[in-house]
Amino acid sequence: ECVTQLLKDTCFEGGDITTVFTPSAKYCQVVCTYHPRCLLFTFTAESPSEDPTRWFTCVLKDSVTETLPRVNRTAAISGYSFKQCSHQISACNKDIYVDLDMKGINYNSSVAKSAQECQERCTDDVHCHFFTYATRQFPSLEHRNICLLKHTQTGTPTRITKLDKVVSGFSLKSCALSNLACIRDIFPNTVFADSNIDSVMAPDAFVCGRICTHHPGCLFFTFFSQEWPKESQRNLCLLKTSESGLPSTRIKKSKALSGFSLQSCRHSIPVFCHSSFYHDTDFLGEELDIVAAKSHEACQKLCTNAVRCQFFTYTPAQASCNEGKGKCYLKLSSNGSPTKILHGRGGISGYTLRLCKMDNECTTKIKPRIVGGTASVRGEWPWQVTLHTTSPTQRHLCGGSIIGNQWILTAAHCFYGVESPKILRVYSGILNQSEIKEDTSFFGVQEIIIHDQYKMAESGYDIALLKLETTVNYTDSQRPICLPSKGDRNVIYTDCWVTGWGYRKLRDKIQNTLQKAKIPLVTNEECQKRYRGHKITHKMICAGYREGGKDACKGDSGGPLSCKHNEVWHLVGITSWGEGCAQRERPGVYTNVVEYVDWILEKTQAV
């Protein structure tokens, strides 16, 4: 059962796993949710009736019955982990805590103009978990405007104390706001020879990598596969760190694989969920339950639905035994990983899928692409919206993309002559324009934010944000697309699609059904050759076939150029301009979204 509300002046008795320090009960709940075993917690707020050394303690608890006896205690706030809930969960914490000093290892001290600058510095520093900033009102003159970057073994403070005129906060890496590069490759036959901070058992290098990403201190990892010569180290996942943040050296070793934490690009691929099945593999751990199940898929469902289950092993039924049902062993451990992995015993193993909801919304798997044909199907491009104007009559004006629950990204040139946001309507989850009737629900537009350097599409800065009057509830047919990460500037996208209801040729009309076309990206040098009269800047990106024939056209403006990379769709471009439509050697020109990520974040996060 999902219980989201916090219980004031209430303490859960017993079941203690560990104690951490958090600046609020709300964040204590998040820490509990991400902890492999925590189901309940008790947080102690600051209070004159409490011993100050107990302020801000967050006691993580577990219980076989999923609940514990409640005791009245002033200043105690208790609650349940979100593991029991089905809604989206995020470790992202943008809160700034006034007059709190979050203690940790102070490894970097520098002057910053503001707490926001200090937080950005923390977010862009590979080691930083949280920071404390001394404001300009801080009593000690030499400490004013000092930004202290901190880290700890757990990623949470070792203690929190009251301190006037300072503010503290967390790194925003888990909010996908880091500018650190992210290295997604896994390097075969490679051992990274740096400090091990922890080790766990994992069935493959991908799971090892996801565990590393989830671990506060892990920057890179080495995994020894099941063919590794030393038996005691098989399936061992070594979580590593170094002072520079990168491996100091690498050693070539057969049957070892190494890679990097994806903490800086957490939004770009799902990281918490291990959805594969491992055949002829047994996961050992503390047994929670043994249940009969028809298949390994059914066993995984049982594990996912049992809140304490972390992983499972399914042993298929022997012929004509137990109505064809096998045994499903539901298991757990102190760290969420098997204590040992054995091969060759015939079991099928896997992990709970309850961690999937901790992925970012934009990474959620969408319907597979329909190969061939130009008409889309429902749910194929769930971030695509149709922007209508109601003046003088209602019509499709431009495309746009959902990038947040209150934000649409589109092109600035769409708003030529649009005097007020009141005449705009955003329709999401639409396949056919004919679906839009008088009573079709839409999102009103609260604000149009056009880039202040925009003059005309051809000169760049053709980008605009629409702030919606109400929030979008994400469903299969309406959900956001990931923004490209600034650390991914070197990515070469090979699977890019332009979508929209625009014209199919220059003299045409708006299409009823959402159209799609797969279009290759063109280098800016090549694009510049095709548009000698224009300046193709690095803030633009071009796409099109040399022979023409497929392109965006009138009415597609503002819509997405969506590129799939590592199974995740990224909003690489915004349809902007071009010479004619689908003309030979005249690629379409798109706003290069990665160059505007800072601008987007600045505008969408403004209070």
Partner: antibody
């Protein structure tokens, strides 16, 4: 097939920074299967590895040169570059760029299989 | 750093001779060793990788063997185009290091 071409000034003054670029043609630098390396050879001497870079930006340097070396990659231009600061006459050498195969397609194929023709750099005032 | 010691530093041989060059690593490198051929004024050319695997396009008269610390490059029947300098290289651990080279000269 893949070809590498070094470019940069042949003469550098002492204490200045040596800058070389290697352009990759006939294939993409954007591949997890390769590191892109710089090697130098002093006149009449053996080969000395300077460092390597992966398209992702991951770099490894020779510790003897680490404080002075920067290797970078530009996937959009299909190039990688070498910068060696505070040069002296001891840095006079032929500089090669090379492709270092790192487990191409899982067949454990390794080694520097493609080299540039080399560019002679003289450090002199 | 791993030191790679090649011997001999030079060898004089005739066409048709069998030539053996050895390379010793200062510590075990499994089979992470390559052999290169370099002719004057030219870039090195990869002959052997993973101690014994022949690079495609390289004549079969070249072979490599060894594992751990001791490695050998053998040219079974020396041809006129084989007169060059040969280098071994370890890539077991960074920094990558080369041997000092063995010059194969005409007798």
């Amino acid at each position: 097939q893949v070809q590498l071409q070094e470019s940069g000034p042949g003469l550098v003054k002492p204490s200045q920074t040596l800058s070389l670029t290697c352009t990759v043609s006939g294939g993409s630098i954007y591949s997890g299967a390769y590191y892109w390396s710089w090697i130098r050879q002093h006149p009449g001497k053996g080969l000395e590895w300077i460092g390597s870079i992966h398209y992702s930006g991951l770099t490894y340097y020779n510790p003897s040169l680490k404080s002075r070396v920067t290797i970078s990659v530009d996937t959009s231009k299909n190039q990688f570059s070498l910068k060696l600061s505070s040069v002296t006459a001891a840095d006079t050498a032929v500089y090669y760029c090379a492709r270092d195969v790192d487990d191409s397609s899982g067949d454990e194929h390794y080694g520097m299989d493609v080299w540039g023709q080399g560019t002679t750099v003289t450090v002199s005032s | 750093d791993i030191q790679m010691t090649q011997s001999p530093s030079s060898v004089s041989a005739s066409v048709g001779d069998r030539v053996t060059i050895t390379c010793r690593a200062s510590q075990g490198i499994d089979s992470w060793l390559a052999w290169y051929q370099q002719k004057p004024g030219k870039a090195p050319k990869l002959l052997i990788y993973a101690a014994s695997s022949l690079q495609s396009g390289v004549p079969s008269r070249f072979s490599g063997s060894g594992s751990g610390t001791d490695f050998t490059l053998t040219i079974s029947s020396l041809q006129p185009e084989d007169f060059a300098t040969y280098y071994c290289q370890q890539y077991h651990i960074v920094p990558i290091t080369f041997g000092g080279g063995t010059k194969v000269e005409i007798k």
